[in-house]
């Protein structure tokens, strides 16, 4: 799975959209997750609407926002006020009981706001 | 396993550039940050800066002025660039990867400044 | 920049002891503190990520906590290859910082 990097600058938000099969994933909630090392777990940081047919509410953790189209086949995650330390490894996840696919490998990078200089 | 090793050489003189490169095998450098901490002998660490996949840049302010940092991803290697060394600038060098926290590091390889 | 102070700057301890390390920010870190271990000639090590994620490998007796900027690192026995210099370091903010360490060293 190739990893998909976008840049965000510090202060300002960043839209990540991860596309799926609408079909496949039929039912299935989704999450946003941190990979802190590769044989670690990843780290949920939040999930779609516990009622699936509610996925299309914002459902927010912190500066974090996510929010699924379910019929277009497409999970947004947005970060809101960047920080330096959001910098890093994150997954989109299609979630099936207590298995999780990977929907998405995103590295996020977070740039100086050159105003700040 | 990631393993990184610092390289470049341990002597430089006051004035000069510092060069030091790093070369990571057993992974991509691709899909991670990388970043340069150091420390003087019996002291504590300090970061230098970090370069990110795409090439950008973040420099510990103590430092901006001189540094510079690039990522070669065919070579699996990126570097260090310091000018107008002085003494103050006599420390192990660690390459380590940045990812969330620094979760590999090079052995570290000593520079040293001094005519 | 984030000010991390570590204290006690020396811990003389025996083998089979508690240590408790402790590490205060000077501003909000939000979590993202990190402990290492470094010892003698080598290259620091990661323990703990996000002020209490055991880094993979990393032995159950190591633990992290926090309470608001206060941070501390736990080592419930020591064992002889524990005596070592620790560090925390944030990554919340620009430049990332270290704190200046704690040596546990053997009573």
């Known amino acids: 799975l190739n990893t998909t990097v976008l840049q965000g600058m510090a202060g300002q938000s960043l839209r990540v959209s991860c596309t799926y099969d609408a079909l496949k994933h039929w039912g299935r909630r989704k999450a946003w997750c941190r990979q802190l090392g590769e044989e670690g777990p990843c780290q949920r940081v939040v999930s779609t609407h516990g009622v699936w047919l509610l996925a299309f509410l914002k459902k927010r953790n912190g500066s974090t926002v996510i929010a699924d189209d379910t019929l277009a086949g497409t999970v947004t995650i947005t970060l809101k006020n960047l920080q330096a330390g959001d910098a890093g490894l994150y997954q989109c996840q299609s979630l099936r009981g207590r298995e999780a696919e990977v929907l998405q490998k995103v590295l996020v990078e977070v740039l100086e706001d050159p105003l700040d200089d | 396993q990631v393993q990184l090793q610092e390289s470049g050489p341990g002597l430089v003189k006051p004035s000069e550039t510092l060069s030091l490169t790093c070369t990571v095998s057993?992974?991509?450098?691709?899909?991670?940050?990388w970043s340069w901490i150091r420390q003087p002998a019996g002291k504590g660490l300090e970061w230098i800066g970090l370069?990110?996949?795409?090439?950008?840049?973040i420099y510990n302010p103590s430092v901006k002025r001189r540094v510079t940092m690039s990522v070669d991803t065919s070579k699996n290697q990126f570097s260090l660039k310091l000018t107008s060394v002085t003494a103050a600038d006599t420390a192990v060098y660690y390459c380590?990867?940045?990812?969330?926290?620094?979760?590999?590091w090079g052995q570290g390889t000593l520079v040293t400044v001094s005519s | 920049e984030i000010v991390l102070t570590q204290s006690p700057a020396t811990l003389s301890l025996s083998p089979g002891e508690r240590a408790t390390l402790s590490c205060r920010a000077s501003?909000?870190?939000?979590?993202?503190l990190a402990w290492y271990q470094q010892r003698p000639g080598q290259a620091p090590r990661l323990l703990i990520s996000?002020?209490?994620n055991r880094a993979t490998g990393i032995p159950a007796r190591f633990s992290g906590s926090e309470s608001g900027t206060d941070f501390t690192l736990t080592i419930s026995s020591l064992e002889p290859e524990d005596f070592a210099v620790y560090y925390c370091?944030?990554?919340?903010?620009?430049?990332?910082?270290f704190g200046q360490g704690t040596k546990v060293e053997i009573k």
């Open positions: 370091q944030q990554r919340s903010n620009w430049p990332w910082t």
């Open positions: 370069i990110y996949t795409s090439g950008s840049t």
């Open positions: 501003q909000s870190v939000s979590s993202y």
């Open positions: 380590a990867r940045d990812l969330f926290y620094f979760d590999y």
């Open positions: 996000d002020a209490s």
């Open positions: 057993g992974g991509s450098i691709s899909s991670y940050y």
